[in-house]
């Protein structure tokens, strides 16, 4: 289907391929292979959903996600003395978010300019590979973090070097797995020139031949193996965690821990409901419809779901906040435009001068660099 009788190919609901080069003539462009999309697809590619809504969301994700994940990675690498497994998983989560978010200015420009990709084939492949890589990395590291949180409640043993090494090993295995499963996204030609719209799309229009069966099988496999199975593990870990916390003794400290655990569970649940479930479900439905009907009627929903999946880069910092004392302190102080060092100095001076209760309670509310995992 890549090359029809007349060496031409058609897209179906943003699917299809021009297999060949194009060259500019006096007026317009002459393409060696005909490529056309259906009218609905064309309306999506030229409509406000992709040219206004998407860039707005991606701008928010970039503006929030870049500094918060950047700070998180810095805190976990350089400001956390004990590298607990949770810290290791969160550092990887932050790294995955950063690797995806750094490409967003190109993605924003692409959508603002009417879904016209001008940055070349290689950059498009990198952007798409990192886009999906981030989503599946986030799911897997979130699963590891969730299982680890439950493990800490069941076995509240001290930090051991062995546990940290296991966490590092698991993290490396996850990166390797994601690299392997996203290889098809790097290998496949992702850019395509659509003569009717005079635009070159990146990933929005894909080779028909590939899509009919392969894309459906690919995303179905990912949805089962890298979404459903980890989601089941995460849910199980949190259900067991809630049971454990309910049955445990209720002193002031454990009540605080319980509240934070519930906040963490709600955050992760929100992430699954907003980011991971809609995108994975619609990826499968979208490609199933293309496979069976030749066009997808859920394209608009699919595009919104994929867009919302990037919000995980904004939600992840809340996870860090509820899990890590160090990140919590740095986040609070960053928002109050203070450094932890300044707060420590304030604390020392306030303690030595034996200030009023109000002052000391104020200073203590935003300090402490101790960690409890």
């Amino acid at each position: 289907t890549i090359q029809g009788t007349n060496r031409s190919s058609k897209g179906r609901s943003l699917i299809g391929k021009v297999d060949g080069t194009s060259h500019v003539t006096g007026k317009g462009v002459t393409v060696e292979t005909v490529f056309s999309v259906d009218e609905f697809s064309a309306s999506v590619l030229t409509g406000k959903l992709t040219t206004v809504f998407l860039p707005i969301v991606y701008t928010i994700v970039f503006v929030v996600g870049l500094p918060s994940n950047g700070m998180a990675l810095w805190v976990f690498l350089f400001r956390t003395k004990k590298k607990h497994p949770a810290v290791i998983y969160m550092a990887n989560l932050a790294l995955a978010d950063l690797l995806s978010v750094i490409w967003f200015p190109l993605k924003i420009a692409y959508h603002i300019h009417g879904n016209n990709w001008i940055y070349g084939e290689a950059l498009c492949n990198v952007l798409i590979g990192f886009f999906y890589g981030n989503m599946y990395c986030s799911i897997l590291f979130m699963t590891c973090l969730s299982v680890q949180r439950y493990w800490v409640i069941v076995n509240p043993m001290g930090h051991s070097r062995k546990k940290a090494n296991i966490a590092i090993g698991i993290s490396l295995a996850i990166w390797l797995l994601i690299l392997l499963v996203t290889i098809p996204l790097y290998v496949v030609k992702q850019t395509i020139f659509i003569p009717a719209l005079n635009i070159t799309t990146c990933h929005d229009v894909l080779p028909e031949q590939l899509l009919v069966g392969d894309m459906f099988n690919y995303f179905l496999s990912l949805a089962i193996g890298v979404f459903l199975f980890p989601a089941f593990l995460t849910a199980s870990a949190y259900v067991l965690m809630i049971r454990m916390l309910r049955s445990s003794a209720m002193d002031e400290n454990s009540e605080k821990k319980r509240k934070r655990a519930i906040k963490l569970i709600v955050t992760v649940l929100a992430m699954y409901l907003i980011c991971f479930t809609p995108s994975n479900l619609l990826l499968v439905v979208h490609y199933f419809l293309i496979k069976s009907q030749g066009q997808s009627h859920v394209y608009a929903l699919y595009i919104v779901a994929l867009c919302l999946s990037t919000l995980n880069s904004c939600i992840d910092p809340f996870v860090y906040y509820f899990v890590s004392h160090d990140f919590r302190d740095h986040a609070k102080n960053a928002l109050l435009c203070r450094s932890v060092r300044t707060v420590k100095q304030m604390q020392v001076s306030l303690t030595s001068k034996k200030h009023s209760r109000k002052s000391s309670s104020y200073s203590s509310s935003s300090t402490t660099v101790k960690t409890s995992y």
Epitope: T5, R12, G28, V29, E208
Partner: antibody, heavy 119, light 106 residues
């Protein structure tokens, strides 16, 4: 109403260039594409090429090296130029209107012009 | 490359007859098949597009069905003015025409 009309020489010498014009009315060439199709005597139809509403063009792979499609939107005319004609290029040549999208058919066609390649 | 096989090549029927013309694609073309009517010395005329959608001004006796690889044009009650050559066109991947069916009156 929508109308397309092909015009050009009925007889062309082998190795010469064929020039055909498709004059349209009832629609804008900026909004619609125009396709060229030919039908050799007693044979089936063959798609030749297309010019989109934005001026982009594409050609049948087998004719690509000999074919050029252009247009003049102000005159509502589309032109087909094919060089190095051979006797097997003898056919009825049609132009048709196309919206430019995959799910649209060639909804209106011209009457066609018979071109004979002979010395 | 998608090949379109149209059958029969010739068809003779009487006025009032139910006539069916078939078109078979070499691979799945989903719904992207159109039917055209061409009378001698006239421009081809669109009858049915996207398998079963009737073009404006076309009598309701013409109908289309099928999906995937097998498609059918049906004339429920043949009229004298329906004498013509009918051909199918796939536009799922490029454009390929069927060989045509010449319909005449008995």
């Amino acid at each position: 109403q929508v109308q397309l009309k092909e015009s050009g020489p009925g007889l062309v010498q082998p190795s010469q260039t064929l020039s055909l014009t498709c004059s349209v009315s009832g629609f804008s060439l900026s909004s619609y594409g125009v396709i060229w199709v030919r039908q050799p005597p007693g044979k089936g139809l063959e798609w030749m090429g297309v010019v989109w509403g934005n001026g982009n063009t594409a050609y049948n792979f087998t004719l690509k090296s000999r074919l050029t499609i252009s247009r003049d939107t102000s005159k509502s005319q589309v032109f087909l130029k094919m060089n190095n004609l051979q006797t097997e290029d003898t056919a009825m040549y049609f132009c048709g209107r196309w919206r430019g999208f995959k799910d649209y058919p060639f909804d209106y066609w011209g009457q066609g012009v018979m071109v004979t390649v002979s010395s | 490359d998608i090949q379109m096989t149209q059958s029969p090549s010739f068809l003779s029927a009487s006025v009032g007859d139910r006539v069916t013309i078939n078109c078979k694609a070499s691979q799945n073309i989903y719904k992207y098949l159109d039917w055209y009517q061409q009378k001698l010395g006239e421009a081809p005329k669109l009858l049915i597009y996207n398998t079963n959608s009737l073009h404006t001004g076309i009598p309701s006796r013409f109908s289309g069905s099928g999906s995937g690889t097998d498609f059918t044009l049906t004339i429920s009650s043949l009229q004298p003015e329906d004498v013509a050559t009918y051909f199918c066109l796939q536009h799922n991947s490029g454009w390929t025409f069927g060989g045509g069916t010449k319909l005449e009156l008995k």
